[in-house]
């Protein structure tokens, strides 16, 4: 139902990378508009991104406040132009996007190598611990923070001569890894969130090697 | 329900080759590491090597590099153990499984196992 | 690599026995320590992980344990579908390594 000259929103998506989060629709408007109505399951409804003409909505202020929630929104589609203008059912046409869980869903995104050190045939590598917008006491937190030990990192290390990838874990954000002496190693890491069934995995940071201006080399 | 259903096996003369196919249901590969691991006639297992079909990375026991690929193809959801140059002592039957990928459990499910027979 | 060397190979037990099965790593593994089962023309099953947590629906008899760089493998009262093969695998490293194996038989 609804008014000849709008059509309802389809292909609700959500778009979430370390809890910044962005709900996609389409279509393109032609002569119509948009606002976004956003809500926890047990919550009221909270009105975003009025009367755009975009196809997409920055919700990641509302999902931040409690990331365990489980959030669902809508898309109501209006005439540009009337916005007061209702449906036949005396409502305007909406769609409703599929469940949200930000904890569990949001995708993780590419971590970066912070620094590695060598000492002797040890290497200590470190995941820079990105910021996040989820807030707590003002503060903004890290993945870390927020994830606690649900958050692992893969360590992906070889020898710059070989193809063969060894690979490291920890439930922080560094490793300490045994290497071969005299031998130049490049690594990459990867967040992971294994007791996730879907994504689980980041994309992998950008190689490293040694010999690089990332490392520091000490001789013991 | 998760499950991993291998296939491929066969009887294969020394110096033949043989790919062996490593079929999920249940998960998404690239959510996952895969492993293949042997066991030979009477034997204990002998892990062979892991694929990351996320990025590709993978790793070999030594008595199989240069002769074992591990490969992976996400849109059929399956692993792959391509073996080259075969040998009379790489008659086993190969397990692929899953590993869980957190620091404290690995190898969560198995396969049933598909026999490969080296023999002239 | 790291070695992992269990014992004993083969030990034959009665129903409602304890059973210990040892296994030692040639160097420090943390937990990172699992245990399977295996019984003939079936693959592994895990058993126990990081050393001491029991798998999801793995009776509570089978129990594990560390000690710096020793792991125990205890069954408590030994039932007739216990009889099988065990191992021990590490995963602190690549390459995961496993113990040879420890058949348990029927007395």
């Known amino acids: 139902s609804g008014t000849t000259n709008t059509v309802a929103a389809y292909n609700l998506t959500w778009k979430s990378t370390n809890f910044k989060t962005i709900l996609e629709w389409e279509p393109k408007p032609v002569n119509q508009v948009y606002t976004v109505q956003i809500s926890t399951k047990s919550g009221d409804w909270k009105s975003k991104c009025f009367y755009t003409t975009d196809t997409e909505c920055d919700l990641t202020d509302e999902i931040v406040k409690d990331v365990k929630q489980t959030y669902l929104a809508r898309v109501f589609s209006y005439p540009a132009g009337n916005v007061e203008s209702t449906g036949s059912a005396g409502e305007p046409l909406y769609e409703n996007s599929p469940e949200f869980t930000p904890y569990l869903e949001t995708n993780l995104g590419q971590p970066t190598i912070q620094s590695f050190e060598q000492v002797g045939t040890k290497v200590n590598v470190t995941v820079e611990d990105e910021r996040t917008l989820v807030r707590r006491n003002n503060t903004f937190l890290s993945l870390r923070d927020v994830f606690g030990k649900d958050l692992i990192y893969t360590l992906y290390y070889w020898k710059s001569s070989s193809s063969g990838k060894k690979t490291a874990k920890t439930n922080t954000n560094e490793f300490l890894i045994d290497v071969d002496k005299g031998e130049n190693y490049c690594f990459s890491v990867q967040a992971v969130i294994p007791s996730r069934t879907v994504n689980r995995k980041s994309t992998d940071s950008p190689v490293e090697c040694m010999g690089q201006e990332k490392g520091e080399f000490r001789e013991i | 329900e998760v499950q991993l259903v291998e296939s491929g096996g066969g009887l294969v003369q020394p110096g033949g080759s043989l790919r062996l196919s490593c079929a999920a249901s249940g998960f998404t590969i690239s959510d996952y590491w895969i492993h293949w691991v042997r066991q030979a006639p009477g034997k204990g297992l002998e892990w062979v090597g892991y694929?990351?079909?996320?990025?590709?990375?993978?790793y070999y026991a030594d008595s199989v590099k240069g002769r074992f690929t591990i490969s992976a193809d996400t849109s059929k959801n399956t692993a792959y153990l391509q073996m080259n140059s075969l040998r009379a002592e790489d008659t086993a039957v190969y397990y692929c499984a899953r590993d869980y990928g957190s620091l404290h459990v690995q190898l969560d499910y198995w396969g049933q196992g598909t026999l490969v027979t080296v023999s002239s | 690599d790291i070695q992992m060397t269990q014992s004993p190979s083969s030990l034959s037990a009665s129903v409602g026995d304890r059973v210990t099965i040892t296994c030692r790593a040639s160097q420090d593994v943390n937990t990172a320590v699992a245990w399977y089962q295996q019984k003939p023309g079936k693959a592994p099953k895990l058993l126990i992980y990081?050393?001491?947590f029991l798998y999801s629906g793995v009776p509570s008899r089978f129990s594990g344990s560390r000690s710096g760089t020793d792991f125990t493998l205890t069954i408590s009262s030994l039932q007739p579908e216990d009889f099988a093969t065990y191992y021990c695998?590490?995963?602190?490293?690549?390459?995961?390594?496993f113990g040879q194996g420890t058949k348990v038989e029927i007395k």
């Open positions: 990081s050393a001491s």
């Open positions: 694929i990351d079909p996320a990025n590709g990375y993978t």
């Open positions: 695998q590490q995963h602190y490293t690549t390459p995961p390594t």
